[in-house]
């Protein structure tokens, strides 16, 4: 058993048939010695009396908020949560496996630049009685500070018969140098509590590997005289690291017809303009990627040819 | 350790070109190592990230763009020198700060060159003949060093009397390639920045 936060304790349980469970001794936080009674989860039914209460925790129903009272007055609370281990593996029932970029990916993170700011998100089908708490650091043995906000519900989607909820959190490394060469990864730890179930999820990454620039901005077309060609121009996204001559981007320009089956013409360039042939009803899209470290491409920025 | 002596710079373009070739070569070599050594811990997640130039050179700090010198987090680790912009580049004269930056890059390349050559000598003794260093990568390191045009004491290649542990050598190769790729990215960024200044 260990303390998650004040008055909240996690009981780690090996889950198998006939498992003996964990014996937990709860002590009432009071100088009082006599006339103490114990109840569980808002029920008035008395479970026991005395300054301590010993319980055998075997399953979820044995957890909950244990309260000690004296003469109708509440003295203290202890909330017990369960962390379930089956076949040596901690349960991952609360979050959905996103399977990208590999199986058992519960947390996904992205950064728009090298400032040390990043966003992580996760998915669940659970809609109620759910809380998350996020901690992060650079390295684990001698951790350096990363500050994370509160996790918030950022999207809801319908997937077949199920509703899926996306939560996200923003974190910022306390003292980040955009030009630094990372040798210790960022660690992100998410504590998830659903009813009386506790689970924890972790992700470890270098900012350089989770970079995904915003799409190029101010995408414009300039027709060239007496030609089907157009000059496409764009700018670096505002969120990208500066100076741009140091944090350079490379771009992919694509001409796509109305039909998805039509052949796509693609041009790669380090410049912020390109000359392409604009077909009728086609659209021109541009996306960006770090020029020197091949992490993710940005989403496309698009304009119609007409 | 003697600091390399700066000689007049013949323009940044050749360095930019060579640094791009370097990044391409080390990325290809790393990809090859990851494929060939698929049953060894050779991915970014599996290896320890070591920097053989740590405490010997200060490339990131010495080559910090002027715009980032206002960022205290970029300055906190040591007395930082940084690239200054000004007429020095236009007149093709290397400023003192830039000389420190480029000499630091040169020293990096020299250290990695020695390590890679020593390692290659060991890998050539491996009866499995599983992986060798790409000669193109070694050549590109050499070309960039020549383009930087520093005169520096040559470092003798390390020789080892004991029987090489090929498993450890291959893991060390992965560690070295990952670190060198990260440094090659920094070098490319620096050359791009200098080229634009």
């Amino acid at each position: 058993i260990w303390e998650l936060k004040k008055d909240v304790y996690v009981v780690e349980l090996d889950w198998y048939p006939d498992a003996p469970g964990e014996m937990v001794v709860l002590t009432c936080d009071t100088p009082e010695e006599d006339g103490i009674t114990w109840t569980l989860d808002q029920s008035s039914e008395v479970l026991g009396s005395g300054k301590t209460l010993t319980i055998q925790v075997k399953e979820f129903g044995d957890a909950g908020q244990y309260t000690c009272h004296k003469g109708g007055e509440v003295l203290s609370h202890s909330l017990l949560l369960l962390h379930k281990k089956e076949d040596g593996i901690w349960s991952t029932d609360i979050l959905k496996d996103q399977k990208e970029p590999k199986n058992k990916t519960f947390l996904r993170c992205e950064a728009k630049n090298y400032s040390g700011r990043f966003t992580c998100w996760w998915l669940t089908t659970i809609s109620t009685d759910l809380t998350f708490s996020v901690k992060s650091s650079r390295g684990s043995s001698d951790p350096q500070g990363v500050t994370c906000g509160a996790a918030t519900l950022s999207a809801e989607r319908v997937r077949g018969d199920n509703k899926e909820y996306e939560y996200s959190v923003e974190c910022q490394e306390d003292s980040a140098c955009p030009a630094a060469e990372e040798s210790l990864p960022i660690e992100v730890m998410v504590d998830a509590v659903h009813k009386l179930k506790y689970e924890n999820y972790t992700s470890s990454f270098f900012i350089r590997d989770i970079i995904k620039p915003d799409p190029p901005k101010n995408l414009q077309l300039k027709p060239l005289k007496n030609s089907r060609q157009v000059e496409v121009s764009w700018e670096y996204p505002d969120t990208w690291s500066t100076p741009h001559s140091y944090f350079s981007l490379t771009f992919c320009v694509q001409v796509q017809g109305k039909s998805k089956r039509e052949k796509k013409d693609r041009v790669f360039t380090d410049k912020t303009s390109a000359t392409v042939i604009c077909r009728k009803n086609a659209s021109i899209s541009v996306r960006a990627q770090d020029r020197y470290y091949s992490s993710s491409w940005s989403e496309w920025a698009s304009v119609p040819c007409s | 350790r003697n600091l390399p002596v700066a000689t007049p710079d013949p323009g940044m373009f050749p360095c930019l070109h060579h640094s791009q070739n370097l990044l391409r070569a080390v990325s290809n070599m790393l990809q090859k190592a990851r494929q060939t050594l698929e049953f060894y811990p050779c991915t970014s997640e599996e290896i320890d990230h070591e920097d053989i130039t740590k405490d010997k050179t200060s490339t990131v700090e010495a080559c910090l763009p002027l715009e980032l010198t206002k960022n205290e987090s970029c300055l906190n680790s040591r007395e930082t020198s940084f690239i200054t912009n000004g007429s020095c580049l236009a007149s093709r004269k290397t400023s003192f700060m830039m000389a420190l930056c480029l000499s630091s890059i040169y020293e990096d390349l020299k250290m990695y060159q020695v390590e890679f050559k020593t390692m290659n000598a060991k890998l050539l003794m491996d009866p499995k003949r599983q992986i060798f260093l790409d000669q193109n990568m070694l050549a590109v390191i050499d070309e960039l060093m020549q383009a930087l045009n520093f005169n520096s004491e040559t470092v003798p290649q390390k020789s080892s009397l004991e029987e090489p542990d090929f498993y450890k050598t291959k893991i060390k190769l992965c560690i070295l390639l990952h670190a060198f790729r990260i440094r090659a990215v920094t070098i490319d960024r620096v050359m791009s920045y200098l080229n634009a200044s």
Epitope: F60, G61, K84 | -
Partner: nanobody, 124 residues
Framework: EVQLVESGGGLVQPGGSLRLSCAAS????????MGWFRQAPGKEREFVAV????????YYPDSVKGRFTISKDSSKNTVYLQMNSLRAEDTAVYYC?????????????????WGQGTQVTVSS
Amino acid sequence: EVQLVESGGGLVQPGGSLRLSCAASGRTFETIAMGWFRQAPGKEREFVAVIRGSGVATYYPDSVKGRFTISKDSSKNTVYLQMNSLRAEDTAVYYCAATTNRFKNTDYTTYDYWGQGTQVTVSS
């Protein structure tokens, strides 16, 4: 999902005893409490006995206290209701139920899973 199957109901004389069993299957580890509820014709469903978890707490209404005992064999995923000193007013369909809710474990409206019910008739 949790599936519940009751057994053990039947006809018994006043003062007699019966033991009901409820076998649970499926995601039983998600349940917080299991209980027995009964419903006589034309009456609302009422709570008879509830066991919390592996037995940290048991709840009974005054009408059955001292006569009925709820117990659980976690290894068999089975909950039992031992009914002694049965009376005519105990006649009803007895339902086994399971809840994933922490609170109001004696309120049948908070229960997620139900068995099909077993008839208990107390009559001479």
